[in-house]
């Protein structure tokens, strides 16, 4: 027993005077703690405890399960220890099978001796299965066997605690070892949608998946830039060994303008964190923006084909859409479509398709969507190009020659003259009178221009060219003179 | 030696509160998440409500979400259940039990306190 | 949630009789299914975890097995102290649920 300087407060002594005492089973326990100060007895094994407020304990008839470490306290704190082993050949291992270990930690598989002189205490594998190459252990009658730095791969591992008792090896009742992972990467983290659109009064509800080794990951939701807690609503699943889910589901029942905002879901562990964000934008009533994808006037040529295109976001989605045209509705040759698969998507293509569009077909086309909030439209005018076309050209009875063409832009009407039997006319003749005739009528289709000149002023045979034209093409009509004497004796007109 | 120990139970009013206490010894009490598992008389056992080793995430049955409250004091080794606005169909033994290797398993149970909700 | 439907909901039996009860999960819950015991006025006591791990201290007359939806808890050779109610309870998920118990009498 330790001896301290006089004065000092000294601990118990117990009797007999070792640190190990064998006993058989059915053997008498007779420890004696001397303390003038003597406080308690303490029994330890494994996860039990009793305490003896007698100076002197006896057990009459050990058994296996008194083996264990008896322990003297005095009134001071101070204590002596005995360790008891109480050998019955019929059980050498106490045992605790409750074995979890940390990775990456020791664990202790809680098989104690109830003697300490057997041999070749160890770990073994469950039906003579060998254990992990990498497995180490350091084995302690009293305690147990240490397993070294516990790895994930031991997890379900089967052992039993094994000793050699006269040459016979014993194994000890099974354990498993249950691992508890330790975070060697950040949580992933995912979020059911990246946005979400809602009209005031609509319930807002968004779930965050947590996935990692444990449940002991910890998440949460958050509002950026507020410290607001959050109602969350959580499901988990247990995937298998080291695959835990946690499903995190915020709910606002009735969102508000001011929630709109962005939304955090937040993860972290030991190793660190990671987050995702969804944004909310609630608005107090739904819209529909169109974005034609064209210019809305449009200049097609005659008989060509042009596809009118808008882009539109409606919220929420579009009950109605149609193209008009002159008070009529088309019921084919167009087709509407959302922008993008996505499940939050809000942008959709409209499109019309005309094709061989005639002088005729001009106007305007109107595109019209709703929803059950709003209407909205949007008109593209349609001109179409056509070549000029020479309606009348004739000799007027005042003399004048005339010539009236329509086509789309307005079409220019140049004279020429051209003598003798000449084809190429080349001399300029400047007109008397241009007008456009129809400028006040419908604003598409085509415009139709009358120009006249003096026939008086042509002395001689010939030709009389009326060219009437535009960005698209030209025509021509003609006029021929013959003279007798001083009369203009016929005057006809070809094109 | 592994033990919890519950507390708190009582007679109390509908609509009125009360708060448990589970005091937790012989283990690393913030290793572990921990419960709390009612069983009215003469019926089955109801999961109520759990919480991580560190107290960050709490989880509730549908039937007392909004209600009760858990939290734990890891410097206390105390795990707490708040139960406001009681309800009749409350009244139950309340045990408070330890989730064994983070799976959800009650290797370790309390003695249970008695709640008595009546008017 | 996860519905736990045990059956049957009580059994008589005498002593070093061979007893089963089954417990089905309404949707897979792989081999997360465990058996509490509880006797009149006490805390349940875990038996069987992970459906067929015996807990420490849990005598091997009790065994566990099945997986997905179909469990069964069998008592090879029922003793004295065996008279109980049994329940049965998923950790697959949250909320967690329990069967609705078996309750084992004497015969």
């Known amino acids: 027993q330790p001896s301290v300087s006089p004065g000092e407060p000294s601990p118990p002594s117990i009797h007999p005077a070792k640190s190990e005492l064998i006993v058989r089973v059915g053997n008498e326990i007779r420890l004696l703690c001397i303390d003038p100060g003597f406080v308690k007895w303490t029994f330890e094994i494994l996860d039990e405890t009793n305490e003896n407020k007698q100076n002197e304990w006896i057990t009459e008839k050990a058994e296996a399960t008194n083996t264990g470490k008896y322990t003297c306290t005095n009134k001071h704190g101070l204590s002596s220890s005995i360790y008891v082993f109480v050998r019955d050949p019929a059980k050498l291992f106490l045992v605790d099978r409750s074995l979890y270990g940390k990775e990456d930690n020791d664990t202790l598989v809680r098989c104690p001796l109830t003697d300490p002189e057997v041999t070749s205490y160890s770990l073994k594998g469950c039906q003579g299965k060998p254990l992990p190459k990498d497995l180490r252990f350091v084995p302690d009658p009293k305690a147990g066997i240490t397993i070294k730095s516990v790895k994930r791969a031991y997890h379900r591992l089967c052992l039993h605690c094994s000793a050699d008792q006269e040459g016979k090896s014993v194994l000890s009742d099974k354990f498993i070892l249950k691992v508890r992972p330790a975070f060697k990467a950040v949580p992933v983290v995912s979020v059911s949608k990246a946005s979400y659109l809602l009209r005031e009064g609509e319930e807002f509800t968004v779930t965050c998946t947590i996935k990692d080794v444990s449940s002991s990951v910890y998440s949460t939701w958050k509002r950026e830039n507020s410290q607001t807690k959050l109602q969350e609503k959580y499901n988990s699943w247990h995937h298998g060994d080291f695959n835990y889910e946690r499903q995190a589901t915020l709910t606002i029942s009735s969102a508000r303008v001011n929630d709109s905002g962005v939304f955090m879901c937040y993860a972290n562990n030991t190793f660190g964190s990671a987050n995702v964000t969804t944004t909310l934008e609630v608005v107090d009533k739904g819209f529909i923006n169109i974005f034609p994808m064209i210019n809305t006037t449009v200049f097609v040529n005659d008989g060509e084909n042009v596809d009118l295109i808008v882009e539109y976001e409606a919220f929420p989605k579009p009950e109605h859409q149609q193209w008009i045209y002159m008070n009529r509705t088309f019921t084919d040759k167009w087709e509407d479509y959302p922008k993008s698969e996505n499940e939050s998507n809000i942008r959709y293509v409209s499109e019309l398709h005309l094709t061989r569009l005639k002088g005729t077909e001009g106007g305007t086309y109107t595109f019209l969507v709703s929803n059950s909030d709003v209407n909205a439209s949007i008109a593209f005018n349609v001109y179409v190009n056509t070549k000029p076309e020479i309606l009348t050209y004739d000799r007027l009875v005042n003399g004048m020659l005339q010539c009236v063409a329509a086509g789309f832009p307005e079409p220019t009407i140049d004279w020429y003259f051209c003598p003798g039997t000449e084809q190429r006319c080349s001399a300029s003749v400047l007109p008397v009178d241009v007008q456009t005739l129809n400028a006040s009528g419908p604003p598409f289709g085509k415009l139709v221009v009358q120009s006249s000149i003096d026939s008086s002023a042509f002395k001689h045979n010939g030709t009389v060219e009326c060219k009437a034209y535009n960005d698209v093409g030209k025509t021509s009509a003609y006029f021929n003179f013959a003279f007798k004497g001083n009369n203009k004796e016929q005057i006809h007109p070809h094109t | 030696e592994v033990q919890l120990l519950e507390s708190g139970g009582g007679l109390v009013q509908p609509g009125g509160s009360l708060r448990l206490s589970c005091a937790a010894s012989?283990?690393?009490?913030?290793?572990?998440?921990m419960n709390w598992v009612r069983q009215a008389p003469g019926k089955g056992l109801e999961w109520v409500s759990a919480?991580?080793?560190?107290?960050?995430?709490?989880f509730y049955a549908d039937s007392v979400k909004g209600r009760f409250t858990i939290s734990r004091d890891n410097s206390k080794n105390t795990l707490y259940l708040q139960m406001n606005s009681l309800r009749a169909e409350d009244t139950a033994v309340y045990y408070c039990?330890?989730?064994?290797?983070?799976?959800?398993?009650?290797?370790?149970w309390g003695q249970g306190t008695l709640v008595t909700v009546s008017s | 949630d996860i519905q736990m439907t045990q059956s049957p909901s009580s059994l008589s039996a005498s002593v070093g009789d061979r007893v089963t009860i089954t417990c089905r999960a309404s949707?897979?819950?792989?081999?997360?299914l465990n058996w509490y015991q509880q006797k009149p006025g006490k805390a349940p006591k875990l038996l069987i975890y992970?459906?067929?791990d015996l807990q420490s201290g849990v005598p091997s007359r009790f065994s566990g097995s099945g997986s997905g939806t179909d469990f069964t808890l069998t008592i090879s050779s029922l003793q004295p102290e065996d008279f109980a109610t049994y329940y049965c309870?998923?950790?697959?998920?949250?909320?967690?649920?329990f069967g609705g118990g078996t309750k084992v009498e004497i015969k």
């Open positions: 039990a330890r989730s064994n290797y983070e799976q959800d398993v009650f290797d370790i």
């Open positions: 012989g283990f690393t009490f913030s290793d572990y998440s």
């Open positions: 919480i991580t080793g560190s107290g960050g995430n709490t």
């Open positions: 949707q897979t819950i792989y081999r997360y």
């Open positions: 992970d459906a067929s």
């Open positions: 309870q998923q950790s697959y998920s949250i909320p967690i649920t």
